[in-house]
């Protein structure tokens, strides 16, 4: 009778074991062990017992002791079970961001590990077990579905293997995968609200505001504002579940035309976008052109108004005929036209909006000098010793210089209050002089003496 000890062994992969083969007869013809494993016999006294060291045991094996005794041949097997923890325990890669309300499938792959009968795979959220299954197949795969909730944000999911060798007198060997940190988010189906000017003039600044409610977690939302290829740099203000992004936009002549204004909100692996068109226009004020800004009385003057090719102008309230970007009027300059304003108003339609621009020019008419009866009476009669103010107003543009002299030397104090004396009496020659020429007028002062009364 052949016996083996131990009859059952559990050992780590690559490990060694001592196996004793014994026989019940004293003088066996043969006693040995049959195994593909490297073996080393340990020398013992007697010939009915042999001890072998079996080394580098990589997989389950059943070495067989055999003996040949006078009463026949017999065998006995020992069962070597190799244990080893899994090589890799991994959660299948997932996007770190998951939308709330979506079903998330967690898949754990376990490579290797033995004995499989003692190997269990556990899927966890934090320390909470979601699923526990025996490891089957290579790789062993365990999956579970999780309905993503808002309160799962930041939760760690992991996969753990348990090689439970406690029934065999060993321990519980655990391997855990790298955790997968779930980041949940809510991005509403409604696009962001975009408030901006519909039209914007070249070389001016406008303000753009993009906002959205119902986001979670709002602090993780990325906002991208752009006008055409120009990225805007907004100032973002966050609420509990909302944000408002405000940016200044400057446009130049290069941007002229219809541009796309976009506001994109990116949260997790999703985005919402709002597009709006902004028309960038160039509309200089109309040009008022006078033949000459300063003309002499009687000169023919042309007043022209020129504006943007697509504008419609009115000149001094009179629309261009035909309606268009140009208007003009002709006049013969009179003194009354001096200081007259010529106002041109231009209207341009940009993206359905009417834009108005004005420009005004003043005409200067050179005339005179002029001395007439109304403003410079030819006869004054004043009582002697009375207080009087001689008045003589010369007209013209430029304003003439006025001098009234008696006998070429004695001046009449124009505009000054004087006491009338006999000396004041006489005929004065009033001379008004300007760059436009000169005029003269005789003014006679009569003084009434009391004795004549």
């Amino acid at each position: 009778q052949t016996s083996v000890s131990p009859s059952k062994v559990i050992l780590p992969r690559g490990g060694s074991v001592l196996v004793t083969c014994s026989t019940s007869c004293d003088q066996p013809k043969l006693l040995g062990i049959e195994t593909p494993l490297p073996k080393k016999e340990l020398l013992l006294p007697g010939n009915n017992r042999k001890v072998y060291e079996l080394s580098n045991v990589q997989e389950d094996s059943q070495p067989m002791c055999y003996s040949n005794c006078p009463d026949g041949q017999s065998t006995a097997k020992t069962f070597l079970t190799v244990y080893w923890t899994p090589e890799r325990v991994e959660l299948a890669p997932l996007p770190s961001w998951q939308p709330v309300g979506k079903n998330l499938t967690l898949r754990c792959q376990v490579e290797g590990g033995a004995p499989r009968a003692n190997l269990t795979v556990v899927l966890l959220r934090g320390e909470k077990e979601l699923k526990r299954e025996p490891a089957v197949g290579e790789p062993a795969e365990v999956t579970t579905t999780v309905l993503v909730r808002r309160d799962h944000h930041g939760a760690n999911f992991s996969c753990r293997t348990e090689l439970d060798l406690r029934p065999q007198g060993l321990e519980l060997f655990e391997n855990t995968s790298a955790p997968y940190q779930l980041q949940t988010f809510v991005l509403p189906a409604t696009p962001p609200q975009l408030v901006s000017p519909r039209v914007l003039e070249v070389d001016t600044q406008g303000t753009v505001v993009c906002s959205l409610d119902g986001l979670f977690p709002v602090s993780e939302a990325q906002v991208h504002l752009a006008l055409g290829d120009q990225r805007l740099n907004p100032t973002v203000t966050y609420g509990n579940d909302s944000f408002s992004a405000k940016a200044s936009v400057s446009v130049t002549a290069e941007d002229e035309g219809t541009q796309r204004l976009t506001c994109a909100v990116i949260l997790g692996n999703q985005s919402q976008e709002t597009l709006q068109t902004v028309t960038i226009y160039s509309f200089p004020a109309p040009n008022v052109i006078l033949t000459k800004p300063e003309v002499s009385e009687g000169t023919e003057v042309t007043v022209k108004c020129e504006a943007h090719p697509r504008a419609k102008v009115t000149l001094n309230g009179v629309p261009a005929q035909p309606l268009g970007p140009r208007a003009q009027l002709l006049l013969k300059a009179t003194p009354e036209d001096n200081g007259r304003s010529f106002s041109c108003s231009a209207t341009l339609e940009v993206a359905g909006q009417l834009i108005h621009k004005n420009q005004t020019r003043e005409l200067r008419v050179l005339y005179g000098p002029r001395l007439d009866e109304r403003d410079c009476p030819g006869n004054w009669t004043w009582p002697e010793n009375s207080q009087q103010t001689p008045m003589c107003q010369a007209w013209g543009n430029p304003l003439p210089e006025l001098k009234c002299l008696k006998d070429g030397t004695f001046p009449l104090p124009i505009g000054e209050s004087v006491t009338v004396t006999r000396d004041l009496e006489g005929t004065y020659l009033c001379r008004a002089r300007s760059t436009q020429g000169e005029v003269t007028r005789k003014v006679t002062v009569n003084v009434l003496s009391p004795r004549y009364e």
Partner: antibody, heavy 120, light 112 residues
């Protein structure tokens, strides 16, 4: 004892397809994955892909994606490597090898190899 | 892809003498779980490769203890303490840390 028996040598014309088999014995077929490796003349060994004999899931080297298809028949304990649109560069010895799915403990048992010659 | 460079390309050795083969990786072969999946194979003429060492230093079953593996990170070595006639062939290192899995170019061991 563990054995992987591969189908015989193949000679194919460019543009044709070929399907090589690898029959496993001496162990529980679904306990191990099967990998395919090729050795072209004068070239180093190249890993082609792997199949989980249990689930049928496959993983391929980017180089061979679209070129090869690995399948298995659990009832016959056999894995297959199919190569399509053959070119002369596909001339090589193709080996199947037993291992864990990610090959972490090495390829412990290999088939004898199937020589594929692609020539017009 | 990870490139494994073996040196020498060829190694003539006297029977009974030691032999050493080096394998250098273009990047670390330490996996995120701390294990290093570097293996060694021997391919004799007309035969498929045969696993000798797995995970840097673990001898596969049936592999004589004259074979040993060592190394870490990017540098690995296969040593044969006393070369025997049956050790002749091409030795390959291989990595299963990074996808796709790759092999070294091989080192031919021959008897002087």
């Amino acid at each position: 004892q563990v054995q992987l028996q591969q189908s015989g040598a193949e000679v194919k014309k460019p543009g044709a397809s070929v399907k090589i088999s690898c029959k496993a014995s001496g162990y529980t077929f679904t306990d191990y994955a099967l990998h395919w490796v090729r050795q072209a003349p004068g070239q180093r060994l190249e890993w082609i892909g792997v199949i989980s004999t249990y689930s049928g899931n496959t993983k391929y080297s980017q180089k061979f994606q679209g070129k090869v298809t690995i399948t298995r028949d659990t009832s016959a304990s056999t894995a297959y490597l199919e190569l399509s649109s053959l070119r002369s560069e596909d001339t090589a010895i193709h080996y199947c090898a037993r291992s864990l799915y990610f090959g972490s403990s090495g390829f412990d048992y290999w088939g004898q190899g199937t020589a594929l010659t692609v020539s017009s | 892809d990870v490139v494994l460079t073996q040196t020498p390309l060829s190694s003539p050795v006297t029977l009974g003498q030691p032999a050493s083969i080096s394998c250098r990786s273009s990047q670390t072969l330490v996996y995120r779980n701390g294990n290093t999946y570097l293996h060694w194979y021997l391919q004799r003429a007309g035969q498929p490769p045969r696993l000798l060492i797995y995970k840097v230093s673990n001898r596969f079953s049936g592999v004589p203890d004259r074979f040993s593996g060592s190394g870490a990170g990017t540098d690995f070595t296969l040593k044969i303490s006393r070369v025997e006639a049956e050790d002749v062939g091409v030795y390959f290192c291989s990595q299963n840390t990074h996808f796709p899995y790759t092999f070294g170019g091989g080192t031919k061991l021959e008897i002087k």
